[in-house]
């Protein structure tokens, strides 16, 4: 028995509006009906939880109202979007997937997506 495999892209560049999207796909060893997805950020030897959501298979992924994440699910694939990113948020974003129900419990952790965020240059003042 090995850890559940979780795949995610190696690198993503956030948009000029500070939005980054990536897919987190997991190889489910069983027929899970309740799945928990957590996005973790590792940078400068610190690990912080960015957001988390639990969803029932076939239903929408629901994050807390004040979460910077949104997402949709389709089978064993979760499409994640993180917004409000700034240059200081550049780091390795890791997808953690837990199959909560029915037993047995499984845990999988992706290899991380390096998200690069570049703050847009302020528009120069115009003389019009």
């Amino acid at each position: 028995c090995k850890a559940m495999h979780v795949a995610q892209p190696a690198v993503v560049l956030a948009s000029s509006r500070g939005i980054a999207s990536f897919v987190c796909e997991y190889a489910s060893p069983g027929k899970a009906t309740e799945v928990r997805v957590t996005v973790l950020r590792q940078a400068d030897s610190q690990v912080t939880e960015v957001c988390a959501a639990t969803y029932m298979m076939g239903n929408e992924l629901t994050f807390l109202d004040d979460s910077i994440c949104t997402g949709t699910s389709s089978g064993n694939q979760v499409n994640l979007t993180i917004q409000g990113l700034r240059a200081m948020d550049t780091g390795l974003y890791i997808c953690k997937v837990e199959l909560m129900y029915p037993p047995p419990y499984y845990l999988g952790i992706g290899n991380g997506t390096q998200i690069y965020v570049i703050d847009p240059e302020p528009c120069p003042d115009s003389d019009f």
């Epitope: 028995c1 090995k2 850890a3 559940m4 957590t38 973790l40 590792q42 030897s45 610190q46 690990v47 912080t48 939880e49 390795l92 890791i94 953690k96 837990e98 419990y105 845990l107 999988g108 952790i109 290899n111 991380g112």
Partner: nanobody
Framework: EVQLVESGGGLAQSGGSLRLSCAVS????????IGWFRQAPGKERETVSC??????SYADGVKGRFTISRDTAKNMVYLQMNSLKPEDTAVYYC??????????????????????WAQGTQVTVSS
Amino acid sequence: EVQLVESGGGLAQSGGSLRLSCAVSGSTLDPFVIGWFRQAPGKERETVSCINRNRASYADGVKGRFTISRDTAKNMVYLQMNSLKPEDTAVYYCAASPDKAFYTDQTMCNIHYYGYWAQGTQVTVSS
């Protein structure tokens, strides 16, 4: 299915020793980091130590007093606790995390990465 079972907790005098054991079933040890965590009453669960194939890491408060080791033939991980202090009193948990290339010495023990948890064993250190 990965399962972990601890043993070895109990009562010790200040300055004494205890050895905790964590038996891992359902997998070999190699794909995982095995960590020890503890939770004192009214406090958050905190990292004690963890170990993978290549290295071990310790929380600052236990360095030099606690030693983590693993026996791959028996699928066991041990936590040898020496020079115990009353503040070491807590429920101790062993847990497993998939071993990842991006883990550093500072992050491989981070509680966010763990998901397979044992039931916990009480350690009480009396003064």
